[in-house]
């Protein structure tokens, strides 16, 4: 009986050359998180969280991708091919599997200053 | 060497309480559900819930809700389960039972208690 | 809640004989599934997780098949220490177990 929800930092932009945290929350549920999964647009895996081994970030993201803050992922030296869909895909005893989408856009450096909400100065 | 260990066999009259423990050892207490499952004499087995051992939080399954109750204690990485208002019919053995695997394609209960016989006679 | 039904219940078998053990869930449980053995006055042990991935340790005669709602375990070669009795185990919701299927020497 899945009675959880995810909620993600949606639809987010974010300067080439800079840094920006993919944030998912998973709520209203007793369930017990095992393992949150990242992934990229392409289905490529980025880092996965696991409850008992900690963080393990692949190797072809190894410069870019920082652990959290929390359950997140900081994505650092943005280039415009990091523009897509990312997942976060939250592996819970009893529920299953919750997933959260989010959207990132890196714009030129040149575009003008946009919400910094989730963005690290 | 990981491994769940329980407490031993109580002999209770109708009425009692008690109080059963399972320690655990060998890996990180609070990143793994714990689970208690029933098998009365001669029955097959019965999953009374389980705890989370990160919040603290049980859930009971049905016909478990009321004199059952699930505990933890983390600081000594053990779960308890305590019966109140003990029945002739509570006589079972009773288990603990850690859910393995990280991804919900890995998960069962992969390292068990020994077991501890709960007989409620007069 | 989903209930699984085990078939047979009681199996009488020699050893070398291989092994048939069947699980139906009453709806759609992917590949969710485990197998226990349990020995008289002993606690059950995995031998297999997602119908048919062999937990470590578990002798390869052991093996699993299934999605949805049908589910097989087969012992290819009964050995001695075999006879025991095996249940089925869902994980697509709350955990329910089967009934059971009883091994015994013919």
């Known amino acids: 009986m899945m009675t959880g929800t995810i909620e993600t930092t949606g639809n987010i932009s974010a300067k080439k050359g800079g840094s920006v945290i993919l944030q998912c929350h998973l709520s209203s549920t007793m369930a017990q998180v095992t393992q949150v999964n990242w992934e990229q647009h392409d289905h490529s895996l980025l880092a996965i969280r696991n409850a008992e081994l900690g963080w393990h970030i692949y190797p072809a993201f190894k410069d870019r991708v920082a652990p959290g803050p929390g359950l997140g992922l900081t994505l650092q030296s943005l280039t415009m091919n990091d523009t897509g869909e990312y997942f976060c895909t939250y592996h819970t005893y009893p529920d299953g599997t919750y997933r959260g989408r989010i959207f990132l856009e890196v714009l030129e450096s040149s575009v003008a200053e946009h919400s910094a909400r989730f963005q690290i100065p | 060497e990981i491994q769940l260990v329980q407490s031993g066999s109580e002999l209770k009259k109708p009425g009692a309480s008690v109080k059963v423990s399972c320690k655990a050892s060998?890996?990180?207490?609070?990143?793994?559900?714990m689970n208690w499952v029933r098998q009365a004499p001669g029955q097959g087995l019965e999953w009374m819930g389980w705890i989370n051992t990160n919040t603290g939080n049980p859930t009971y399954a049905q016909g478990f809700t009321g004199r059952f109750v699930f505990s933890l204690d983390t600081s000594v990485s053990t779960a308890y389960l305590q019966i109140s208002s003990l029945k002739a019919e509570d006589t079972a053995v009773y288990y603990c039972?850690?859910?393995?695997?990280?991804?919900?394609?890995?998960?069962?209960?992969?390292?068990w208690g020994q077991g501890t016989m709960v007989t409620v006679s007069s | 809640a989903i209930r699984l039904t085990q078939s047979p219940s009681f199996l009488s078998a020699s050893v070398g004989d291989r092994v048939t053990i069947t699980c139906r869930a009453s709806?759609?449980?992917?590949?969710?599934l485990a197998w226990y053995q349990q020995k008289p006055g002993k606690a059950p042990k995995l031998l297999i997780y997602a119908a048919s991935t062999l937990q470590s340790g578990v002798p390869s005669r052991f093996s699993g098949s299934g999605s949805g709602t049908e589910f097989t375990l087969t012992i290819s070669s009964l050995q001695p220490e075999d006879f025991a009795t095996y249940y089925c185990?869902?994980?697509?919701?709350?955990?329910?177990f089967g009934g059971g299927t009883k091994v015994e020497i013919k």
């Open positions: 185990q869902q994980l697509n919701s709350y955990p329910t």
């Open positions: 709806q759609g449980i992917s590949s969710y």
């Open positions: 060998g890996y990180t207490f609070t990143s793994y559900p």
């Open positions: 039972a850690r859910v393995g695997g990280y991804s919900v394609d890995e998960y069962a209960f992969d390292v």
